[in-house]
């Protein structure tokens, strides 16, 4: 079974900069999975942000503008990354990755 690790416990960024979060997949080939990213803001329910499927198809939360969150995967390091562009106060949250084994 697949296992996920998010090596960064926390990330502190200056406003308007870019934050890059990592999710390391083990126990399964990342190219045979879909990786989903969610966020949980303080006092709010968890929210789907973006996913990248086994075939590279990206799906995003319809309410968030294109260009805000960018998901990628690097098979060589078995890592999925979530890039948050133009960091703002409303991006303060806990971010989770999740795995769907195809």
């Amino acid at each position: 079974a697949g296992h996920l690790e998010q090596p960064q416990i926390s990330s502190t960024k200056t406003l308007s900069k870019t934050a890059r979060l990592e999710c390391v997949v083990s126990g399964i080939t990342i190219s045979a999975t879909s990786v989903y990213w969610y966020r949980e803001r303080p006092g709010e329910v968890i929210q789907f942000l973006v996913s990248i499927s086994y075939d590279g198809t990206v799906r995003k939360e319809s309410g968030i503008p294109s260009g805000k969150f960018e998901v990628d995967r690097i098979p060589e390091t078995s890592t999925s990354t979530l890039t948050i562009h133009n960091v703002e106060k409303q991006d303060i949250a806990t971010y989770y990755c999740a795995l769907w084994e195809v």
Epitope: G56, I64, S66
Partner: antibody, heavy 121, light 108 residues
Framework: EVQLVESGGGLVKPGGSLRLSCVAS????????MDWVRQAPGKGLDWISS????????FYADSVKGRFTISRDNAKNSLYLQMNSLRVEDSAVYYC??????????????WGQGTMVTVSS | DIQMTQSPGTLSSSPGERATLSCRAS???????FAWYQQKPGRAPRLLIY???SRATGIPDRFSGSGSGTDFTLTISRLEPEDFAVYFC?????????FGGGTKVEIK
Amino acid sequence: EVQLVESGGGLVKPGGSLRLSCVASGFTFSDYAMDWVRQAPGKGLDWISSISSTSNYIFYADSVKGRFTISRDNAKNSLYLQMNSLRVEDSAVYYCANSYNWNYGGAFDIWGQGTMVTVSS
Amino acid sequence: DIQMTQSPGTLSSSPGERATLSCRASQSVSSSYFAWYQQKPGRAPRLLIYGASSRATGIPDRFSGSGSGTDFTLTISRLEPEDFAVYFCQQYGRSPLTFGGGTKVEIK
């Protein structure tokens, strides 16, 4: 049918103001981020602004920052672009656009017909 | 900002011929966030390709996209009369979203 219809374009003098509207139908407008893209006559496409479904994320191109304001009224299924301090170089067809199919990852698959803005003295 | 440069500016071809359009990004772009659009005079753009190589719904299979990093290609295997139009590339992975200047495919 999923549809976007823009209005509000016209002729305005440099330094003037104009408010564009885009009315959406055929989908749950309040669930979707929306964008404005413009095209000067005979030129390419220029993205100018985005707004999230709840208006908490708003982005602008540098060329319009401080002059244009994007907003929306989900109760009226409407998107707006308030354009102030207009310049001759703002003359263009203005389109509202939307990434409707979630499989497309954010590419714009729904476009309005456009509304023409001409800035001239 | 990521600049997108398309070439050639104009491509003169005949129906039935193969057309190859190029788009180069000023910095690496994830192929998952790369699109091609077609625009005819007086009309809004129409999405052809998303994710660099996936055809949007209803797009004929004579249109294909490829590429990664900074270099992307749109190929029209056999030009039909309705394919003569202007084509734009776009990156939509990071704001500001940016488009190429366009390639006009005209009848020779």
